[in-house]
Interface confidence: medium
């Protein structure tokens, strides 16, 4: 059954800079990935990046660099400066649209005990919405 994992890491070199990595564990072909913060996209969250396998990538501040890592995983680096910068307890969500199954979403945040540069392993997070 499809699942989504989310990993959040604070960069050791820039303490207010975050890297979010998300992956899809499923057999369907990915049509779209949406990364948001503050909650699920469409349910109070704010979109940070949209990645489409063919149409390209769009990102919005404070997102600095969104990219595909593999055919089924992405990473997003966030700038840490300014009023819109994330804090340690910010929730980040990734939604994978997989054809033809539908939409699979999971959220994660920085592990409470993690030191800069460290993070929890990328384990599957709870799926919030799926079809």
């Amino acid at each position: 059954t499809p699942e989504v994992w989310v990993q959040v890491r604070m960069e050791a070199t820039e303490l207010s800079s975050f890297t979010i990595r998300c992956g899809f564990l499923g057999s369907g072909s990915i049509s779209l990935v949406t990364v948001s913060w503050g909650g699920p996209n469409g349910a109070g969250g704010t979109t940070l990046a949209v990645l489409h396998p063919e149409r390209g990538i769009r990102q919005w501040a404070p997102a600095r660099q969104a990219r595909w890592e593999t055919q089924s995983s992405i990473s997003l680096i966030l700038e840490g400066s300014g009023a819109s910068s994330p804090c340690a307890n910010t929730t980040f969500c990734c939604k994978f649209a997989s054809f033809p199954e539908g939409s699979w979403e999971a959220c994660g945040s920085l592990p409470p005990s993690s030191d800069p540069g460290l993070s929890a392993p990328p384990t599957p997070a709870p799926i919030l919405r799926a079809d």
Partner: antibody, heavy 122, light 106 residues
Amino acid sequence: EVQLVQSGAEVKKPGASVKVSCKASGYTFTDYWIYWVRQAPGQGLEWMGTIDTSDHKTSYNQKFRGRVTMTRDTSTSTVYMELSSLRSEDTAVYYCARDFIITVNYPVVDYWGQGTLVTVSS
Amino acid sequence: QIVLTQSPATLSLSPGERATLSCSAGSSVNYMHWFQQKPGQAPRLLIYSTSNLASGVPARFSGSGSGTDYTLTISSLEPEDFAVYYCQQRSSLPFTFGQGTKLEIK
């Protein structure tokens, strides 16, 4: 107003093919997938397959693989479902449904065609 | 494929009563969706992703469950609720529907 309008009823002989159309209006055609469901008389619902209208990807129920073909014409916002090698047990009402929008969080099937009755009889 | 078994096949109740419809999956699914169908009409989505009310669906409908066991509940039946109800899974291909529960007036 969002609408899916399907072609009219068909009577076919065993071994023939049928092509049912589903014309969409009232929304951006390529934003949504279309899926097809059929319902034999007095029976339940059966998923036949899904087509991604933006890039023509298809996913078929293995039960129909080799017999079903789903296509789309973006110029007319129409999706087609063709079923070949018809047999009597293919007699059913065939529905198209609007399935998924990439900019909305949840993939809800919220609009359906009115259904097309296909009768297979010798 | 994942077989969905709905129970009961027929449920006879009176308006104002509470209806509980069950859907059991042959193997675990992440979410269940529920459709209502009236004679001569296309199906209508009621509940998506187990517990989310589709647009325009009255609040008397609710869904719950996880794993292999899912439930659709109608808290107080209205005359227009008497119809056939189908569950559907989209966790595994091919997508499958239950055989339906017919909710009839007692």
